[in-house]
Interface confidence: medium
């Protein structure tokens, strides 16, 4: 049924979903507050623009009665309950900020007749690709996939003078929603790293991924794997590993990398950890002072929802259009804007691009190195370091076949 | 399952130091974080410090610049240097552990996040 949207008069409403069932396990208290300080910031500017406007947001709780899995598993119904409470109470805003979870965002959006945008905080997985009005605000596994393509086949730097074609992926069912997401992407036989890729084969068992270690009839040393480190300890431990392997750990959403009193521990040594680049004011900001390195990301994305927001509404009243047509629904895309710690650039999709990481551990310091950025919005690998101190021979990363020479 | 023995405490006065060792059962590297936490009398049990994977330290405001947990992997044990130490650093200290993120990647801030514990060794800073 059709519900009318408190937007319009001067006085524009944000509904923002608050799931018991989310990609991440932060209290909902922090998730308010990183909506308030967006609030704040938003009024601020719409009244620099001489925008004399009401904004406000709606939290809009779930029961919690059944969907009560805490993780993402039993997220589908308690999103569409959520619409359906919301339908209800005939208070819908100009924009619904909500579901992190794939799973509950690909219903909604499947469900309902949308004729206006959706913010989320998550829903990583391919299947919330190329949704007309669903804009997402941490890295989908598509923007994964094809760091790893082009990383893969990129042969012409001084620490990587092989094109890569083979890997393994690792992903035992236990993973964060995040790496749930990023490694079914990988593993999907239509998926662009599948097609792209020549051999790939998922490990799923731990004794799997450590025969492969030292295996001489491995068809590839490339492993894939997603997680925190500890997740990689729990597999290898102190196992010895073959010298032209290279274990690939997928961690976008940690900044632990990056602090000063970080010291990579040994078992390191033959991973590369591809995370996101930290913004700049973050780390020491008062907004984050209370969260883990793990956590400001997905509390940072509500914040910039509702940054991306105050955006596009301040650009459609200055414009004088209106707020609740299709337009509007559609125009959260393709565009920059001004986030909590810097820009924040949306692609054609409505998907945030972002400078992925790749770091290494230095032999030398013990330290993580940046290695190379990759620019999600170009599709495009910066080498950072040239003469990585690197455990592997000559400080060049293995080809991906053993015994196979230059290509 | 992850056994956690605490030793290193006693009595000491004011401005004076300890060094708490906290045996697991388990590899520290193979946690997801472990911390410390105190206990005065009367009071809630309180975070002071932890370590998350990567190595990522963080402390209470209180202990800032004065504590330090660090780690070593072979010997198995965690540990909380405490110099300075003040009669307001009374209490029972425990150490705890949280071996997997889980599919929500725990933060490891509060006592919830945290499964295993380990006995306590009490602490008492006279002035």
């Known amino acids: 049924s059709q519900v009318s949207q408190n937007c319009h008069n001067g006085s524009y409403e944000i509904s923002v979903l608050m799931m018991g069932n989310s990609a991440f396990a932060e209290p909902l208290k922090n998730l308010e507050d990183a909506v308030n300080e967006g609030l704040e910031i938003v009024r601020g500017r719409l009244q620099n623009a001489g925008l004399n406007v009401t904004v406000n947001a709606t939290f809009m709780y779930s029961d919690g009665l059944i969907h009560n899995s805490g993780d993402c598993r039993s997220s589908t119904c308690e999103g569409l309950d959520l619409l359906r409470k919301i339908s209800n109470a005939q208070r819908m805003g100009c924009v619904l900020i909500g579901p992190s979870c794939t799973y509950s965002t690909f219903q909604m959006y499947l469900d309902t007749e949308l004729s206006y945008p959706m913010i989320s905080a998550g829903s990583f997985g391919l299947s919330c690709d190329y949704k007309e009005t669903l804009t997402r605000l941490m890295s989908p596994a598509r923007k994964l996939m094809y760091f790893l393509v082009n990383f893969w086949k990129t042969n012409d730097l001084p620490f990587k003078t092989y094109s890569w074609s083979t890997s393994y992926v690792y992903k035992n069912g236990t993973e964060t929603e995040d790496c749930f997401w990023y490694l079914n992407a990988l593993e999907a036989s239509v998926s662009y790293f599948s097609h792209e890729l020549g051999f790939k084969v998922v490990l799923r068992q731990d004794k799997e991924f450590q025969d492969i270690l030292m295996d001489h009839n491995r068809k590839s040393n490339v492993i894939i794997m997603c997680g925190g480190p500890e997740f990689l300890y729990k597999l290898k431990g102190d196992r010895a590993v073959a010298e032209d392997i290279v274990i690939i750990l997928v961690d976008l959403f940690n900044d632990q990398y990056f602090e000063d009193n970080v010291t990579a521990p040994d078992y390191m040594k033959n991973v590369l950890v591809l995370t996101l680049s930290p913004g700049n004011s973050l780390l020491n900001s008062s907004f984050s002072r209370n969260l883990s390195p793990t956590k400001r990301d997905f509390a940072l994305a509500y914040l910039n929802g509702i940054l991306l927001f105050g955006h596009m509404l301040k650009i459609f009243l200055e414009n004088g259009e209106n707020i609740t047509t299709p337009k509007f629904a559609h125009a959260f895309r393709n565009l920059t804007f001004e986030g909590y710690d810097g820009p924040v650039t949306l692609d054609d999709w409505g998907d945030v691009d972002s400078t992925m990481v790749l770091l290494y551990t230095s032999v030398d310091t013990k330290k993580y190195k940046v290695l190379l950025t990759y620019d999600t919005h170009v599709n495009k690998t910066y080498p950072v370091d040239m003469s990585p101190t690197f455990t592997w021979k000559n400080s060049k990363l293995p080809n991906d076949i053993t015994g196979r020479g230059p290509q | 399952q992850v056994h956690l023995v605490e030793s290193g405490g006693g009595s000491v006065q004011s401005g004076g130091s300890l060094r708490l060792s906290c045996a697991t059962s388990?590899?520290?590297?193979?946690?997801?974080?472990m911390g410390w936490f105190r206990q005065a009398p009367g009071k809630a049990r309180e975070r002071v410090a932890s370590?998350?994977?990567?190595?990522?330290?963080t402390y209470a405001d209180s202990v800032k610049g004065r504590f330090t947990i660090s780690r070593d992997n072979a010997e198995k044990t965690l540990y909380l240097q405490m110099n300075s130490l003040k009669p307001e650093d009374t209490g029972t200290y425990y150490c705890?552990?949280?071996?997997?993120?889980?599919?929500?990647?725990?933060?490891?801030?509060?006592?919830?996040?945290?499964?295993?514990w380990g006995q306590g060794t009490q602490v008492t800073v006279s002035s």
């Open positions: 370590i998350l994977n990567a190595g990522s330290t």
């Open positions: 705890a552990a949280r071996p997997d993120a889980g599919r929500w990647r725990s933060a490891c801030t509060t006592e919830l996040d945290f499964g295993y």
């Open positions: 388990a590899s520290p590297y193979s946690m997801h974080c």
